[in-house]
């Protein structure tokens, strides 16, 4: 396993609809054709997998149908979007990139993006 640099923004604020987007960029050391991207969430020293996708270079990034993540890839950067976030989902979201094929295998883990989620205030009842 060889190490690889990964960069991502330090902080992102989710939209009022609970959507957060950020870029994950990696320093590809060679001609990888198969890449796996995983988003991990770290909160209270617990790390859980949020979503993961494997893609072939030049093809779309495909997450599972029930995933809360979507994304697109362009060269050695991935644009990730996480949906359905609530205030309780606030935490550090870490981008993990693996170059799966061809060998050698490379692994890179970013420093994480702190995503802040603020639940919207409920609208006051209207008389109309």
């Amino acid at each position: 396993c060889k190490a690889m640099h990964v960069a991502q923004p330090a902080v992102v604020l989710a939209s009022s609809r609970g959507i957060a987007s950020f870029v994950c960029e990696y320093a590809s050391p060679g001609k990888a054709t198969e890449v796996r991207v995983t988003v991990l969430r770290q909160a209270d020293s617990q790390v859980t997998e949020v979503c993961a996708a494997t893609y072939m270079m030049g093809n779309e990034l495909t997450f599972l149908d029930d995933s809360i993540c979507t994304g697109t890839s362009s060269g050695n950067q991935v644009n990730l979007t996480i949906q359905g976030l609530r205030a309780m989902d606030t935490g550090l979201y870490i981008c993990k990139v693996e170059l799966m094929y061809p060998p050698p295998y490379y692994l890179g883990i970013g420093n994480g993006t702190q995503i802040y989620v603020i639940d919207p205030e409920p609208c006051p009842d209207s008389d109309f």
């Epitope: 990964v6 960069a7 960029e25 050391p29 060679g30 060269g75």
Partner: nanobody, 126 residues
Amino acid sequence: EVQLVESGGGLVQPGGSLRLSCASSGDTLESFAVGWFRQAPGKEREELACIGRTGEFTDYPGSVKGRFTITRDNSKNTVYLQMVSLRAEDTAVYYCAAERLVFHLCSLSEYDYDTWGQGTQVTVSS
């Protein structure tokens, strides 16, 4: 849009040195990571070096590490490849390529670059 033009190639004796330049005639290069590659006749394109937008991050494959150095001068819109201790096997057409990135990293994979120059010939021979 960025348009890349390489220069600085030519004929050099074994053991000699050359400095190649990659300049943009279009957009400013400071939003782009830049890589240098080469291709010899009948061979695959080979990665040589890359440099991130700010110049703080560089990467090299083991094959040229220590002999080739990549630098950039964003005020001149130019990226350089300094090559020393040249050998006959360094004879090839040398290309630079650019990729717009958000952060400071760069890639050694030719697959990641979408803008390429026309190349400059380097011949190492006595």
